[in-house]
């Protein structure tokens, strides 16, 4: 077969749309991406051209190989839609939109506690707050380092809350909480709060 | 570009049922939050509940009970089932999409579908 | 449940004029305030977030301030199409809401 195909031929499925991707669909501002666009044909000298809207971002020639596109997201309107044409000699396809999702990234959290002191027991409630932050933020409760609750789902601004009561206990126990949301690999923590034993009038948390 | 088209609307008797419906374009509603809101002839605006990328439904307190949102993935549309209607439920029902996939400012918004509900 | 509650409920001005409208929250919500502008027959279009943040294509005569509990809405010189109605919103809590939406103020030509 000839490696040049006319306009009739592309109008088939012998010459497809390209696909445009991207390893992360969520990003955050100022963060630098790269985008693919590929085709099935992987015999043609295929010329790929990016645009986001109308804008004509930049051009590669590539054979076989899809052509990478390296980008910043500075704005919020540079979230997309981003479209890849792909095209042979006068005849061209183009890709489906691709559109990436900005997320601001959480803020570190502030764990706050609130004790009520019984003879036997600690009732503990635990609040935890990202000020900043895409939603939905997850918020998880630790204590000595060990997750004591699932992950809190949080759709608004008001803090997480976890509740649980201890015996009381004889020796020190650190809280924190750690917040994230839907950016990958990107989790803060809440400076540690400790608790201290019962020994003596030593609870600056408690509610007698 | 993103867009919301809401359908559904007309003349319902009280004590009937209607489902609106928003379709959204150019955005993936899997990432963001869709509300619904209401405005009766010469009132204010009032929100009416959300639905969240996993699905998860939240209400005014008003609302609860008698309105249902939902939402279809594949046709990337929400919904707004209204049952029990009364008189006092005649207004311009719009969608809008919030800028984030929790509460937050609604940017984007559907031009309204009129709901009458009269005998 | 957090209540908003604009003022005034309606407002008569000039072409030219500085106009404020304020907002107050029942209990404070941080800066997580916007702002709408509303013509008649027509769907509502943001104007600010967080509380004092312009929206894409907004002219810069809107401005907005505030956090905690009290807010405003300035337009520094009012033009013929800023006559419309206003809301603020709370985008703060979602615990027992009746409604995130401020009453509105109507600014109408004197």
């Known amino acids: 077969r000839k490696a040049v195909l006319d306009c009739e031929a592309m109008k088939t499925n012998e010459f497809p749309s390209p696909c445009l991707d991207s390893k992360t669909k969520v990003v955050m501002k100022g963060q630098n991406v790269s985008m693919f666009c590929s085709h099935k044909n992987k015999s043609l000298q295929i010329t790929y051209s990016l645009f986001r809207r109308k804008t004509h971002l930049g051009t590669q020639d590539g054979k076989g190989e899809p052509a990478i596109f390296n980008l910043s997201i500075t704005e919020a309107h540079e979230s997309g839609p981003y479209k890849c044409k792909a095209q042979v000699t006068s005849c061209s396809k183009y890709s489906r939109d691709f559109s990436f999702t900005i997320v601001d990234p959480v803020t570190s959290p502030v764990l706050n506690i609130m004790v009520i002191q019984t003879e036997t027991d600690r009732h503990i409630t635990l609040h935890c707050l990202s000020v900043n932050g895409s939603l939905p933020i997850n918020y998880t409760f630790f204590e000595n380092h060990v997750a004591i609750s699932p992950a809190i789902s949080k759709y608004d601004r008001e803090p997480a809350e976890f509740n649980l009561t201890k015996k009381n206990p004889g020796e020190e126990e650190e809280y924190r909480c750690e917040a994230k949301n839907r950016l990958p690999n990107y989790a803060t923590y809440s400076h540690p709060v400790t608790m201290p034993s019962t020994g003596g009038d030593s609870c600056p948390f408690c509610l007698k | 570009e993103v867009q919301l088209v809401e359908s559904g609307g007309g003349l319902v008797q009280p004590g009937g049922s209607l489902r609106l419906s928003c379709a959204a374009s150019g955005i993936d509603l899997s990432y963001y939050a869709m509300n619904w809101v209401r405005q009766a002839p010469g009132k204010g605006l009032e929100w009416i509940g959300m639905i969240v990328g996993g699905g998860i439904t939240f209400y005014a307190n008003w609302a609860k009970g008698r309105f249902t949102i939902s939402r279809d993935n594949s046709k990337n549309t929400v919904y707004l089932q209204m049952n029990s209607l009364r008189a006092e439920d005649t207004a311009v029902y719009y969608c809008a999409v919030g800028s984030d996939g929790g509460i937050s400012d609604f940017n984007i918004w559907g031009q309204g579908t009129l709901v009458t509900v009269s005998s | 449940d957090i209540q908003m509650t604009q003022s005034p409920s309606s407002l008569s001005a000039s072409v030219g004029d500085r106009v404020t409208i304020t907002c107050q929250a029942s209990?404070?919500?941080?800066?997580?305030l916007a702002w709408y502008q509303q013509k008649p027959g027509k769907a509502p279009k943001l104007l600010i977030y967080?509380?004092?943040t312009l929206a894409s294509g907004v002219p810069s005569r809107f401005s907005g301030s505030g956090s905690g509990t009290d807010f405003t809405l300035t337009i520094s010189s009012l033009q013929p199409e800023d006559f419309a109605t206003y809301y603020c919103?709370?985008?703060?809590?979602?615990?027992?809401?009746?409604?995130?939406f401020g009453q509105g103020t109507k600014v109408e030509i004197k």
């Open positions: 209990q404070s919500i941080s800066s997580y």
């Open positions: 967080r509380a004092s």
């Open positions: 919103q709370q985008a703060y809590s979602l615990s027992n809401v009746d409604n995130f």
